[in-house]
Amino acid sequence: TPEVWVQVQMEATELSSFTVHCGFLGPGSISLVTVSWGGPDGAGGTKLAVLHPELGTRQWAPARQARWETQSSISLALEDSGASSPFANTTFCCKFASFPEGSWESCGSLPPSSDPGLSAPPTPVPILRADL
């Protein structure tokens, strides 16, 4: 069964900068990736970026840069304008759509114990798993 992993990390140099990394583990080629925060897109979450392998990316503030890392993983840099760093307690969700298999989604957040600059290990939180 395909899976999606989500990893959130705080930048060591700028505590207001966060990066979300997401990846798809499974067969099939990715047609679209949607990244949201505050929950899944369509379920109270807010869309941050949409990445298409051929047609490029679209992003919305506070997303700074969305890009493909590999054919099955992406990264999204975020700029936190507020001093209170709300990203630290926020859930980020990534949805990978593969044709004709379908979509897989997972959410994650910055681990509470993570030190700035230390890469948080991939801790996927599968949601709405169709095989449950």
């Epitope: 679209l32 897109d41 044709f99 979509s103």
Partner: antibody
């Protein structure tokens, strides 16, 4: 103007074969995933077969696996459905449709359909 | 495969009425639901995608909502030209599956 035009349907004997074609125009065919959907006499819709944009990944409805083959020729802007060992339950109106990635794979354009009748 | 149970099968309404069609998925399909309209003698046409997004040119009297397993499609003010069969469809996991359809008839 996006157009999908199906052809190749007709009356066929039980166990016979047919090849459906769908001629696409008005868009970059090679960039889109495509499907064959059928509408039964009871008006139910079933996705019979699907193929991704480059023709590598395919899907088949369980009841047609091993009997139907979906393919595409991106140079000719044409989608195909080879149907063999036809059964009476394959009688339907067959549509080809285009999937839009940005619409969650919803089918934003459909052809007018071609009718397949399997008789004993 | 995911079963989409659509109700009711038939609706007899008057122009100006508000109508609601429901679609229930046998498991979560997140927001990967589309709605189609099929007028007599025509092929289906896309109305809504990602549950609540209007396809190009679709009037805003058509409203979609829901997430997960329960979805509703509403026509806020039915017009004579809305005479059609309406289908929900999930595109979350293959096989993409459709609801059984709702035939809307105008009195």
């Amino acid at each position: 103007d996006v157009k999908l035009v199906e052809s190749g349907g007709g009356l066929v004997k039980l166990g016979g074969s047919l090849k459906l074609s769908c001629a696409a125009s008005g868009f970059t065919f090679s960039s889109y995933h495509m499907s064959w959907i059928r509408q039964t006499p009871e008006k139910r819709l079933e996705l019979v077969a699907a193929i991704n944009s480059n023709g590598i990944n395919t899907y088949y409805l369980d009841t047609v696996k091993g009997r139907f083959t979906i393919s595409r020729d991106n140079a000719k802007n044409t989608l195909y459905l080879q149907m063999s060992s036809l059964k009476s339950e394959d009688t339907a109106l067959y549509y080809c449709a285009r999937h839009e990635d940005y619409y969650g794979f919803a089918m934003d354009y459909w052809g007018q359909g071609t009718s397949v009748t399997v008789s004993s | 495969s995911i079963v989409m149970t659509q109700t009711p099968k038939f609706l007899l309404v008057s122009a100006g009425d508000r109508v609601t069609i429901t679609c229930k998925a046998s498991q979560s399909v997140t927001n990967d639901v589309a709605w189609y309209q099929q007028k007599p003698g025509q092929s289906p046409k896309l109305l809504m995608y990602y549950v609540s997004n209007h396809y190009t040119g679709v009037p805003d009297r058509f409203i979609g909502s829901g997430y997960g397993t329960d979805f509703t499609f509403t026509i806020s003010t039915v017009q004579a030209e809305d005479l059609a069969v309406y289908f929900c469809q999930q595109a979350y996991r293959s096989p993409w599956t459709f609801g059984g359809g709702t035939k809307l008839e105008i009195k």
